[in-house]
Amino acid sequence: AEEQLEGGLRTAKDGPAAAKAAVRFHLRTSKGPEREGCYLSVGHSQPLEDCSFNMTAKTFFIIHGWTMSGMLENWLHKLVSALQMREKDANVVVVDWLPLAHQLYTDAVNSTRVVGLSVAKMLDWLQGKDGFSLGNVHLIGYSLGAHVAGFAGNFVKGTVGRITGLDPAGPMFEGVDIHRRLSPDDADFVDVLHTYTRSFGISIGIQMPVGHIDIYPNGGDFQPGCGLNDVLGSIAYGTIAEVVKCEHERAVHLFVDSLVNQDKPSFAFQCTDSNRFKKGICLSCRKNRCNGIGYNAKKTRNKRNTKMYLKTRAGMPFRVYHYQMKIHFFSYKSVGAIEPTFYVTLYGTNAESQVLSLEIVEQIGLNATNTFLVYTEEDLGDLLKIKLTWEGTSRSWYDLWREFRSYLSQPHRPERELSIRRIRVKSGETQRRLTFCVEDPEKTSIAPGQELWFYKCRDGWRMKNETSPTVEL
């Protein structure tokens, strides 16, 4: 592995000897969270005893990424605390490679393999201790640190239990072969959160799937609460860099959320791409098609590179409640291509939702069933009724003249009118299916500026129920 490693570096002086001095393993145990100087060093058993290293417990290695500040950043402290709170007996080891990470990005990239080797050597040494099992090791790497974790998993003798990649770095890793980046071969289970992927410009986070499961919250690109307006408040005070940091670091905070808000777990759903997810097509939990995110992700029998999606709130707790809505729009005349703006309000036993927009990903299919994704920040309880509103849009004089002429020739139906008899709803979180019908079967039509009410009329869609994520996970 070292020969292979040397080949990937720019100069020999950047090799293992340099890394040894530049990589430190700081052990944090719950027994002494503020204790300083608990450094692990290959071949030195005393710190393991002094710092109460628990050989039979889970061991987490947290690996930071490239840094501009030269200090361990805030997210790391919170992640340490969250892990200690969730896994009280666990060993938490911070892999401090700041001297190599606080360099030009390209130089830091060139150091990832040597740091990975350093982590692997530590793990190889620990494996010689009674009770220590590589299966209990969970490497958590953020940004460049995710690839360091991958190299560690590749170089170690045996197989690490789990690697979590928190928005693995994109530049210089996108599209390269599996031996030069984090990949599913690096651990028994590799789960990845992608929060800053871009199809244009530089993608700070890697776009391609690199794990067994790859989760793309909010499509993996624009994170709520990280827009220019949210982050900068007023343009005069901020920089685009703050938006980048917010979206890139969101992966860490989603992971922390999964540790501390156990009662509010977020679920992700398998889908081939973000657009299909936005259409609401992918809310199934059959055949391991849904999973918890972050710490709550479960190893599945799926092969690899399973892409999963979910929506989130702008802050902790990030959980939202996903609903698939199926609506068949009947049109009694050829109205051409229409782009209506629909809103729904969901009413449940616990609460009512805000007014939710039905996002039209492509265009409305007339005389066809259309699928939409809506999500709420609050738990509505059991759904009881739905209000559907067609927003009145401003139209040109020509449109109005056409509609007026149409009305003269057929006065009973405005041209822009659709009929909806029922709405079928499926909850992503409970996997329950419900059907909502109009109160009066004679009054199913809706035109711009109007609303229609639908009331629960049937449990299910007259189809076989699917398993719920709460049961499966």
């Epitope: 503020e34 300083e36 361990l72 805030n74 997210w75 340490v80 605390s81 606080h102 949210d230 703050e242």
Partner: antibody, heavy 119, light 106 residues
């Protein structure tokens, strides 16, 4: 007991340079990033920059990039801040504060060094 | 840079009174930190990670908030609480402080 002992007050002329020291004791010097903070008279606090004594890595507030230089002497557990091209705007109290690399906040502060610039 | 605005700038409270001061960030922050400073003294860490009290801080103090809005509360004002309190963020560089809230005894 953790202590950050700063050098005494300075009275200097405009255009001069000054080097303020902050001697650390009671903890392992290389385990904590040292930060420097400015407080003008009756005003709030401004972050100047930081240095990681373990390997000398620095980070600066853009506003002070051309004004301040941060260094450390590991053998004497001392952090330094050099301020150059002094003007009356630099009159303030300067604090060093340690940032726990494994806890993430300014947990101990120096007593402050008063800098007066006057012709 | 992320501008932190503290309000009120100056406030006075009677002994035993409940006191709340706020800190608003122009950009969202993950955690807020509070420092207490008395005249001619260095600032002291008072609250970290938004709601954790630093060692030695009386439990009549509490911190809360998220996103852009944070606050420090004293459940029952005591004489020794008269000081200036600064909020501070580490979410993005440059790390900034609020203008301070000076708390006086009425």
């Amino acid at each position: 007991e953790v202590q950050l002992q700063q050098s005494g007050p300075e009275l200097l002329k405009p255009g001069a340079s000054v080097k303020i020291s902050c001697k650390a004791s009671g903890y392992t010097f290389t385990e904590y990033t040292m930060h420097w903070v400015k407080q003008s008279h009756g005003k709030s606090l401004e972050w100047i920059g930081s240095i990681n004594p373990y390997y000398g890595g620095t980070s600066y507030n853009e506003k002070f990039k051309d004004k301040a230089t941060l260094t450390v002497d590991k053998s004497s557990n001392t952090a330094y801040m050099e301020f150059r091209s002094l003007t009356s705007e630099d009159c303030a109290v300067y604090y060093c504060a340690r940032y726990g690399n494994y806890v993430g906040y300014f947990d101990y502060w120096g007593q402050g060094t008063t800098l007066t610039v006057s012709s | 840079e992320n501008v932190l605005t503290q309000s009120p700038a100056i406030m006075s409270a009677s002994l035993g009174e409940k006191v709340t001061m706020s800190c608003r960030a122009s950009s969202s922050v993950h955690y807020m930190y509070w420092y207490q400073q008395k005249s001619d003294a260095s600032p002291k860490l008072w609250i970290y990670y938004t709601s954790n009290l630093a060692p030695g801080v009386p439990d009549r103090f509490s911190g809360s908030g998220s996103g852009n809005s944070y606050s420090l509360t004293i459940s029952s004002m005591e004489g020794e609480d008269a000081a200036t309190y600064y909020c501070q963020q580490f979410t993005s560089s440059p790390y900034t402080f609020g203008g301070g809230t000076k708390l006086e005894i009425k």
